[in-house]
Every structure is written in structure tokens, then in C-alpha cells.
């Protein structure tokens, strides 16, 4: 029977800069029941606080709700593991909410084949930003990436769409069924998961771009 091994805070993520969650990996338990607590203070302050919510983020997590989240301050946090034989502490982690944003996937993806009479046909892809993100405040710039491939193909074709919420693709294989998805990321932060997908059948008379 031993003191617990050193835990590690391995990830912090925020869906929208308004809340965030951090997760830790326990060390060895030393063969005894082990309690974990996360404590933090804000840079420039000495007052230590305990994690406000161990439930929302699931096992081995700490969730910071709106009232505990500040964009303009760095959080310095550590996890304490304690059993009957002693304690161990994780390394301190410095967290700036601005840099840990991972949005939810974009919504409302829809894809249509457009065949104007006077121009080349194209694939028109449209989507909406995730609902948790308020782009009107100007705090956020979301960038989008599209991936598509013929249904049976192994390789995805990637297109960067910038800040647009719609995109045109001209070069496609006639007669193929394509799978299309979109994801987003803030200017600082992480890519979202890929959105739910859309299958689209490209007509046989779709003319490839020159």
C-alpha cells in the first residue's frame, strides 16, 4: 500500500469561451481508495479555490460554469490525489480560455447540385455555425473546413472555406455519390468534430471544370 501516483491534467476545452472543462488522468492508486480534488487560482491572485463542479464533465473532470469563467485571466490549476498513505500533486497547468476553445460541429449542413444554364454546374454547400457560439459579439471568428469524397473512396478532398457559411465546388466526378462534412475552429483554438454528413448524387451529365 502506497501513496497515490502523480495525476496529470491532460486537457481543457471550452465550447464558446463562456464555460470550460478540464480533465485529468489519475496516477496509480497505491492500492487504496483515492480522492481527487482540483484547486486553482487566477494569475495575480493568491486565493485558492476548489473546483466548482466535478459532475458535469464526467469522471476525473472539473467544469467551470459561466460565473467561474473569465476570458481575460489565466487560471493556474493542479490536482491533488489523496489516500490513507499520503498525497501527490499534478504539475501546475496554466489555462487561458481564449486558447482552449473547441466548438461544437456546425449545424444544418445541406448540399445541392446547381446547374445554371449559362455557367458550369457546381456543388453548393451550406451550413450554420454551432448554436452555442454568438458570432455577433465579435469575440469570435469561426473558420470552416469542408471535406468530401466519393462514397467508396478512401481519401478525403479538403477545402478551406474561411469565414463563409457556404461554398461552391466545381470539380467533381459525374455519376458519383459524394459524402460531405464540415467542421469549424475559432481563430485561436481547436477544430470541432466533423458535422453529421450529407450524401449527394452527382448527375451523369455534370460537366467537369476545365
Amino acid at each position: 500500500q502506497l501513496p497515490p501516483g502523480k495525476p496529470e491534467i491532460f486537457k481543457c476545452r471550452s465550447p464558446n469561451k463562456e464555460t470550460f472543462t478540464c480533465w485529468w488522468r489519475p496516477g496509480t492508486d497505491g492500492g487504496l481508495p483515492t480522492n481527487y480534488s482540483l484547486t486553482y487560482h487566477r494569475e495575480g491572485e493568491t486565493l485558492m479555490h476548489e473546483c466548482p463542479d466535478y459532475i458535469t464533465g464526467g469522471p476525473n473532470s472539473c467544469h467551470f460554469g459561466k460565473q467561474y469563467t473569465s476570458m481575460w485571466r489565466t487560471y493556474i490549476m493542479m490536482v491533488n490525489a489523496t489516500n490513507q498513505m499520503g498525497s501527490s500533486f499534478s504539475d501546475e497547468l496554466y489555462v487561458d480560455v481564449t486558447y482552449i476553445v473547441q466548438p461544437d460541429p456546425p449545424l444544418e449542413l445541406a448540399v445541392e447540385v446547381k446547374q445554371p444554364e449559362d455557367r458550369k454546374p457546381y456543388l453548393w454547400i451550406k451550413w450554420s455555425p454551432p448554436t452555442l457560439i454568438d458570432l455577433k459579439t465579435g469575440w469570435f471568428t469561426l473558420l470552416y473546413e469542408i471535406r468530401l469524397k466519393p462514397e467508396k473512396a478512401a481519401e478525403w478532398e479538403i477545402h478551406f472555406a474561411g469565414q463563409q457559411t457556404e461554398f461552391k465546388i466545381l470539380s467533381l466526378h459525374p455519376g458519383q455519390k459524394y459524402l460531405v462534412q464540415v467542421r469549424c475552429k475559432p481563430d485561436h483554438g481547436y477544430w470541432s468534430a466533423w458535422s453529421p454528413a450529407t450524401f449527394i448524387q452527382i448527375p451523369s451529365d455534370f460537366t467537369m471544370n476545365d
Epitope: D104, E108, K126, T131, P196, A197
Partner: antibody
Framework: QVTLKESGPVLVKPTQTLSLTCTVS??????????VSWIRQPPGKALEWLAH???????SYSTSLKSRLTISKDTSKRQVVLTMTNMDPVDTATYYC??????????????WGQGTLVTVSS | DIQMTQSPSSLSASVGDRVTITCRAS??????LNWYQQKPGKAPKLLLY???SLQSGVPSRFSGSGSGTDFTLTISSLQPEDFASYYC?????????FGQGTKVEIK
């Protein structure tokens, strides 16, 4: 209180075009993360998804029926219209409209209309 | 398009029984799987979404599990009002597809 109500003809002749209207209340067709879907169910058979339209006006259609279907919406009238061309007796079914909720890792039909039975017969 | 296969197509059970219905997708759909209940002459009603999230107002005897391609709807203790047809539906990729349904009948 969210409600959806389908309206349209109960009887159409083969080769004719069916036009169904879904009138909604309790939410707006322009609300982010909202949409309306059409689903049908032939007597004694399973549900079949036909089409949907999202708040951003994005549309999707059933692969097998795409060439016959058009979905559109009039946000101010709170209506979504589905048209289906070249009707055939096998299209006899109860046609439902339902609200789509899209959100954080979720996409589902949470409110349904009561359905309207459309019979295709000469 | 993704195919959804439900089993069994029908089952007979008694009040108080534990009932399990399975749904299999022809390819991975993450957790974008919804379950609906339909009674004769009525519109379907949402029970669960995103595989395991219980819709507001639905009794807790209904539960869902699974991700990827294999999903389960469980009714822990069947009640008289639960005799109905149940449908799974994937919303991972359009065109969306429903399972062919499972009819739960009184034994």
C-alpha cells in the same frame, strides 16, 4: 406550445402533383437550429423520410424520390410546403411533418403533426 | 445511403417484462440515433435522441445505448401503455433513414 398541422388534398389522381402544407406554431422557421421534415407511412408499413428544410434554407431530399420532390418555406406565413410530382397509387400514405431540432451533438424530430392520409386513385 | 436494420420485427411480452430492441446501421453513425414510439392511428413520438438522451416527459423505464453501428432500446418494465411500434432513425447523414420497425404485442 409547439404544434404542426398538415393540410392538402386527401385524394389525388395518378400522374397529378401533390402539394402539402405544414403550418407551424410555437416556434419560428427562422430560429437557428430548427427545421421541418416530411415523413410518410404507407398503410401498415414503416416510416419513410422524404425531405427536410433548415432555418438557413438548406434542403435535403430522399435519394429515391429526389427528382419528384420540392420543399420550400414561407417564414412569415409559418408554412413549409412539399410538392411531389407524378403521383402513383404506391404513394398512398399518411404524410407527416415534424420539427427538427439540431444542437450540440443532436439532430432529431421532437414534435410531429397528426398526419394527413393521401390516397392516390383514379 | 445508410441502411438501418431493426430486430426483432415483432415480439410478444407481458406487463412487467424487460424488453430489448436492437438497431444496426450499415456504417458508423457515431451516436446520431433516435428512437420513436408509434401507437395505431397516431403520429410517432420521440423517446430518445443521440442514442441515450431521454426526451423530456418520457418515463425513465425507457433507456438507450450504443454508438457506431449497434444500438439498443430497453424498456425495463413493460407497462400496458407501451404496447406499440418502435422505430429507430439515424440522423448522421442525409438522406435520413428509419428502421423497419418493431411491433411490441401483448403475450
Amino acid at each position: 406550445q409547439v404544434t404542426l398541422k398538415e393540410s392538402g388534398p386527401v385524394l389525388v389522381k395518378p400522374t397529378q402533383t401533390l402539394s402539402l402544407t405544414c403550418t407551424v406554431s410555437g416556434f419560428s422557421l427562422s430560429d437557428a437550429g430548427m427545421g421541418v421534415s416530411w415523413i410518410r407511412q404507407p398503410p401498415g408499413k414503416a416510416l419513410e423520410w422524404l425531405a427536410h428544410i433548415f432555418s438557413n434554407d438548406g434542403k435535403s431530399y430522399s435519394t429515391s424520390l429526389k427528382s419528384r420532390l420540392t420543399i420550400s418555406k414561407d417564414t412569415s406565413k409559418r408554412q413549409v410546403v412539399l410538392t411531389m410530382t407524378n403521383m402513383d397509387p404506391v404513394d398512398t400514405a399518411t404524410y407527416y411533418c415534424a420539427r427538427i431540432r439540431t444542437g450540440t451533438y443532436s439532430l432529431y424530430l421532437d414534435y410531429w403533426g397528426q398526419g394527413t392520409l393521401v390516397t392516390v386513385s383514379s | 445511403d445508410i441502411q438501418m436494420t431493426q430486430s426483432p420485427s415483432s415480439l410478444s411480452a407481458s406487463v412487467g417484462d424487460r424488453v430489448t430492441i436492437t438497431c444496426r446501421a450499415s456504417q458508423s453513425i457515431n451516436s446520431y440515433l433516435n428512437w420513436y414510439q408509434q401507437k395505431p392511428g397516431k403520429a410517432p413520438k420521440l423517446l430518445l435522441y443521440f442514442a441515450s438522451s431521454l426526451q423530456s416527459g418520457v418515463p425513465s423505464r425507457f433507456s438507450g445505448s450504443g454508438s457506431g453501428t449497434d444500438f439498443t432500446l430497453t424498456i425495463s418494465s413493460l407497462q400496458p401503455e407501451d404496447f406499440a411500434s418502435y422505430y429507430c432513425q439515424e440522423s448522421y447523414s442525409t438522406p435520413w433513414t428509419f428502421g423497419q420497425g418493431t411491433k411490441v404485442e401483448i403475450k
